[in-house]
């Protein structure tokens, strides 16, 4: 059960309710577990995980990435700027998570769980953020045309895209987890 659905917390007696930060931490770790399962299927299915083309491939997708200016790294850490970046980044990842649906044969439910759990995570983080006005939501029309373009790719490119999305999303969540633990 995704942590956002709380069933474990309800079932266990004498346990202190999770704080907001603990819930977020748990939610991210749950999504990361899901990504690991999806990556396993992707890497078993194709040789993209060892691809020498990865460096070039980075230029093809505009995937969210943490940079120094985002205030999420230890040097120059800025809680508010970082939180805005995390939420904005997760919102930008949503179109790519939508693309991942139907890309898996044995882990179809896992792909859906990652997508839905990310939506829950965004909600948790939005409650935590003070400066919601600074969060830019991706344009639905732009997202729709991006999705169409990605879905039109050949299978080779779709496998590469899937691998890159999972790898980038994992890195983004790991950076987010480290930053959130400092807040």
């Amino acid at each position: 059960v995704p942590p956002g659905e709380d069933s474990k917390d309800v079932a266990a007696p004498h346990r202190q309710p999770l704080t907001s930060s603990e819930r977020i931490d748990k939610q991210i770790r749950y999504i990361l577990d899901g990504i690991s399962a999806l990556r396993k299927e992707t890497c078993n299915k194709s040789n993209m995980c060892e691809s020498s083309k990865e460096a070039l491939a980075e230029n093809n997708l505009n995937l969210p990435k943490m940079a120094e200016k985002d205030g999420c790294f230890q040097s120059g850490f800025n809680e508010e700027t970082c939180l805005v970046k995390i939420i904005t980044g997760l919102l930008e990842f949503e179109v790519y998570l939508e693309y991942l649906q139907n890309r898996f044969e044995s882990s179809e439910e896992q792909a859906r769980a990652v997508q839905m759990s990310t939506k829950v995570l965004i909600q948790f983080l939005q409650k935590k953020a003070k400066n919601l006005d600074a969060i830019t939501t991706p344009d639905p029309t732009t997202n729709a045309s991006l999705l169409t373009k990605l879905q039109a790719q050949n299978q080779w490119l779709q496998d590469m895209t899937t691998h890159l999305i999972l790898r980038s999303f994992k890195e983004f969540l790991q950076s987010s987890l480290r930053a959130l633990r400092q807040m």
Partner: antibody, heavy 121, light 111 residues
């Protein structure tokens, strides 16, 4: 040796439908996508669509949606394509082709011999 | 959809000489550093035969006189030296995205 054996020529009446087959051998059928290509007499080639034999999932060229239906039978390693509401425009040679998945590329590397369809009253 | 424009429509080349066929895509067929451009040879009554994939990679068993080059939108197939057996139709094809599209073809003959 990889082989794609297609069914024989078809002479059909306008408005009728036809179902052709493509039997694969020499490789694991479910590991490679199958594509269908149309070649009208003396003309170039047109991609009709492709099917994933493992899942049965398919993608069609918009132009052939409603005209062509691709299916597979995993047990006999055979791909099928049905064409319906035939007109003289559908008279052509239809090829099935396997997709080769190269380290750096993606191409139709093995082709069937083609099925000739003639639509005439 | 990506439109593939092939030229010339027909070409006559003397034995031992060079044949060059060009293909232009309406937009780039490159992605992840790979050009998703393929070249096929077709002889009468036969299915197309893959010669070159990813713009310049020769399929095993294809004679070394066939070579491909180009990237982005402009590609070419070179045959040198021209042999009798090379008389055929040649097609370029992009395999970057659906619908996968072919050039109109080039009829290559002996001069």
């Amino acid at each position: 040796e990889v082989q794609l054996q297609q069914s024989g020529p078809e002479l059909v009446k306008p408005g009728a439908s036809v179902k052709m087959s493509c039997k694969a051998s020499g490789y694991t059928f479910t590991d490679y996508y199958m594509k269908w290509v149309k070649q009208s007499h003396g003309k170039s080639l047109e991609w009709i669509g492709e099917i994933n034999p493992k899942s049965g999932g398919s993608r069609y060229n918009q132009k052939f949606k409603g005209k062509a239906t691709m299916t597979v039978d995993k047990s006999s390693s055979t791909a099928y394509m049905q064409l319906n509401s035939l007109t003289s425009e559908d008279s052509a040679v239809y090829y099935c082709a396997r997709v080769g998945y190269y380290a750096e590329g993606y191409a139709m590397d093995y082709w069937g011999q083609g099925t000739s369809v003639t639509v005439s009253s | 959809e990506l439109v593939m424009t092939q030229s010339p429509a027909s070409l006559a080349v003397s034995l031992g000489q060079r044949a060059t066929i060009s293909c232009r895509a309406s937009e780039s067929v490159d992605s992840y550093g790979i050009s998703f451009m393929n070249w096929f040879q077709q002889k009468p009554g036969q299915p197309p035969k893959l010669l070159i994939y990813a713009a310049s990679n020769q399929v095993s068993g294809v004679p070394a006189r066939f070579s491909g080059s180009g990237s982005g939108t402009d590609f070419s197939l070179n045959i040198h030296p021209m042999e009798e057996d090379d008389t055929a139709m040649y097609f370029c094809q992009q395999s970057k995205e659906v619908p996968y599209t072919f050039g109109g073809g080039t009829k290559l003959e002996i001069k």
